[in-house]
């Protein structure tokens, strides 16, 4: 019974203790995107820096080919910010055949891919109409939430238009996840 | 070997267990900023409430002179929201010499200062063009992400224009960090 | 002294270790809101999905009647995103008796209710003027921060106009909290 005093009664065998320092974690930062083919109705995935500057992966959380690979099951906090920038979207010319234009928009989706499941799952979406008057425009979309993930799940960030993503600074566009 | 049964094999000596309740944490809330001179091309830092209302610092995380001081090395989640407000930005008068105006903008930067390093590091940036037509405007910029910090690092929040920051409510503009 | 080696000196009796896997956690997702009466100057609360799709509650964190019920005292990270959508707000017709209209706005508030305290506490607010020209519009407001909560506290999400909330997808509008 000697060791017992360091294991309070509410911590039973079913939930082993684990050091925070060895939990899977990653913070990825933007890089300039290489031109790629993508299907018309499918949002392209961003690829990321995973080791230079502010970026890192640790404790078996690996980045490969646009995906963060989840190394163990558990609850993860997942977040991303994408900064978009563009020239004026002329949605102020609003009347065409007597009705408003469909607005331009910018969208970020954090997507989970599970190999055993045919369809990707959209975990988080930030979507915004863009109807700027008279200027170049720029703005971020931020997302973050907690999800229960399984070992082997893969995470990616998709955007509505890769050409509008601001890739100039690692603090403007990023993607991360950590086991809680 | 008696104590061994409460230390599962994946927790080696290199990563000691530690209680969550004693981790460094802070949530700071907005206060009215005092009149100060600041250089034209340098974003001013906000100062914060650290003990009244919703604000707190705990477990050796200290706030002093606009900085959060990091008391131990590790991975921290850092976040801030700044709500901006202003009168109409006249960017609707768009054509000058046949080209659009440079837009007005609002920017928040979370910055890390390391005494041994000459230049501050920008960890997070949220920047948005502001081109509002015909009214007072107000809007938040939210940022949050995980970073590996070292004991002694200092964190601050800088903004593009301190006079546009909404200081009226502690739930509108805030800054926080916690060790994971 | 045998068990001592697994309890480093900075972990005293006052802060018992606890397994991460048994901490209270919840991620709630949007559902279509049922029409309800609410007072003119009071923002209505959203109700949520708590078990289908991406939504879950665990480890004694319960959802009931628009509230997340906090089962144990501690520091929690709380977050929400609400996506709003609407038809054009005609604030571009700016001159009425020579002055601009008061702007339309969208607001999200995360509120804490403590039974022993008469007034709810606003923990987080995201508020944005909406002055869109020439189109339907849509946009998210994201909030997240850390707060010290007490057992029995209740959390809810209030919005300025329930009819503008996009309830169509679980990844667009959500609410969550987890014990740190």
């Amino acid at each position: 019974l000697k060791g017992q005093e360091f294991a309070p009664s509410h911590q039973q065998v079913y939930a082993p203790l684990r050091a925070d320092g060895d939990k899977p974690r990653a913070h990825l930062t933007v890089v300039r995107q290489t031109p790629t083919q993508h299907f018309k109705n499918q949002f392209p995935a961003l690829h990321w820096e995973h080791e230079l500057g502010l970026a890192f992966t640790k404790n078996r959380m690996n980045y490969t080919n646009k995906f963060l690979l989840i190394p163990e099951s558990g609850d993860y906090f997942i977040y991303s910010q994408v900064t978009f920038r563009g020239m004026t979207s002329e949605c102020s010319e609003i009347r065409q055949a007597g009705r408003p234009n469909k607005p331009d928009s910018i969208t970020v989706v954090i997507t989970k891919v599970t190999d055993s499941y045919p369809e990707p799952t959209q975990l988080l979406m930030g979507t915004k109409s863009v109807c700027e008057v008279g200027s170049n425009w720029f703005q971020p979309i931020y997302l973050g939430a907690m999800f229960s993930l399984q070992e082997g799940d893969k995470l990616m960030v998709n955007v509505s238009d890769i050409s509008l993503v601001d890739y100039t600074k690692e603090d403007k566009t990023f993607f991360g996840a950590f086991l809680l | 070997l008696k104590g061994q049964e409460f230390a599962p094999s994946h927790q080696q000596v290199y990563a000691p267990l530690r209680a969550d309740g004693d981790k460094p944490r802070a949530h700071l809330t907005v206060v009215r900023q005092t009149p100060t001179q600041h250089f034209k091309n340098q974003f001013p830092a906000l100062h914060w409430e650290h003990e009244l209302g919703l604000a707190f610092t705990k477990n050796r995380m200290n706030y002093t002179n606009k900085f959060l001081l990091i008391p131990e090395s590790g991975d921290y989640f850092i976040y801030s929201q700044v709500t901006f407000r202003g009168m109409t930005s006249e960017c609707s008068e768009i054509r000058q010499a046949g080209r659009p105006n440079k837009p007005d903008s609002i920017t928040v930067v979370i910055t890390k200062v390391t005494d041994s390093y000459p230049e501050p590091t920008q960890l997070l940036m949220g920047t948005k063009s502001v081109c509002e037509v015909g009214s007072n405007w107000f809007q938040p910029i939210y940022l949050g992400a995980m970073f590996s910090l070292q004991e002694g690092d200092k964190l601050m929040v800088n903004v593009s224009d301190i006079s546009l920051v909404d200081y009226t409510k502690e739930d509108k503009t805030f800054f926080g960090a916690f060790l994971l | 002294l045998k068990g001592q080696e697994f309890a480093p000196s900075h972990q005293q009796v006052y802060a018992p270790l606890r397994a991460d896997g048994d901490k209270p956690r919840a991620h709630l997702t949007v559902v279509r809101q049922t029409p309800t009466q609410h007072f003119k100057n009071q923002f209505p609360a959203l109700h949520w999905e708590h078990e289908l799709g991406l939504a879950f509650t665990k480890n004694r964190m319960n959802y009931t009647n628009k509230f997340l019920l906090i089962p144990e005292s501690g520091d929690y990270f709380i977050y929400s995103q609400v996506t709003f959508r609407g038809m054009t707000s005609e604030c571009s017709e700016i001159r009425q008796a020579g002055r601009p209209n008061k702007p339309d706005s969208i607001t999200v508030v995360i509120t804490k209710v403590t039974d022993s305290y008469p007034e709810p506490t606003q923990l987080l607010m995201g508020t944005k003027s909406v002055c869109e020209v020439g189109s339907n519009w849509f946009q998210p407001i994201y909030l997240g921060a850390m707060f010290s909560l007490q057992e029995g506290d209740k959390l809810m999400v209030n919005v300025s106009d329930i009819s503008l909330v996009d309830y169509t997808k679980e990844d667009k509008t959500f609410f969550g909290a987890f014990l740190l």
Partner: antibody, heavy 119, light 111 residues
């Protein structure tokens, strides 16, 4: 109704200090910042600084830094402005004013306190 | 140091309309909360007339209106009355978070 009632006129010698009070009523004292504005005889208005009665935080005009101190007594809903090292050019009517949080306009004003600095 | 400039004096006959301008030396004046206008009648404390360029507090007659153009704000009084005679001040906040007042404009109602 909202009222700000200030203390009476003062005559001070150069080098002395003066402390002017402003008693608030008709609203929650801690919910609104109080500003102090002065007006020399025949001159315009000059802003001195603001006080948050809840936290005690203050912001002073650069011209008055080091000479002015603004405080609040929440138990009596009273704001104070103390100006030290007085000189003849500090002769003025001193006003307290309650600020509108959203626009930072000065919505309600005290009646003013004349401070005369003369040897 | 930013400055708000007002004309020293304006005048008008009863029933007429007068406009008082307030010009900023800096583009950031009023960016946050706008320009406010105060009326100070002889021997009294100032009174808020217009806040945020345009908005009249309750109790202020609609003869008083505010407007903005570029780096200038204006106060217009229509249907002048003898009791409008007094000093009028514009006020704003600069980029260093200091409040600024214009130098004041003395309004004389003729006749």
């Amino acid at each position: 109704q909202v009222q700000l009632v200030q203390s009476g006129a003062e005559v001070k010698k150069p080098g002395a200090s003066v402390k002017v009070s402003c008693k608030a009523s008709g609203y929650t004292f801690t919910s609104y910042d109080i500003n102090w504005v002065r007006q020399a005889p025949g001159q315009g208005l000059e802003w001195m600084g603001w006080l948050n009665p809840n936290s005690g935080n203050t912001g002073y005009a650069q011209k008055f830094q080091g000479r002015v101190t603004m405080t609040a007594d929440r138990s009596t809903s009273t704001a104070y402005m103390e100006l030290s090292s007085l000189r003849s050019e500090d002769t003025a009517v001193y006003y307290c004013a309650r600020e509108v949080p959203e626009t930072a306009a000065f919505e309600y004003w005290g009646q003013g306190t004349l401070v005369t600095v003369s040897s | 140091q930013s400055v708000l400039t007002q004309p020293p004096s304006v005048s008008g006959a009863p029933g007429q309309r007068v406009t008082i301008s307030c010009t900023s030396s800096s583009s950031d004046i009023g960016a946050g909360q706008g320009v406010h206008w105060y009326q100070q009648l002889p021997g009294t404390a100032p009174k808020l007339l217009i806040e945020g360029y345009y908005n009249r507090p309750s109790g202020v007659p609609d003869r008083f209106s505010g407007s903005k153009s570029g780096t200038s704000a204006s106060l217009t009084i229509t249907g002048l009355l003898p009791e409008d005679e007094g000093d009028y001040y514009c006020q704003s906040w600069d980029g260093t978070l200091s409040a600024l007042f214009g130098g004041g404009t003395k309004l004389t109602v003729l006749g």
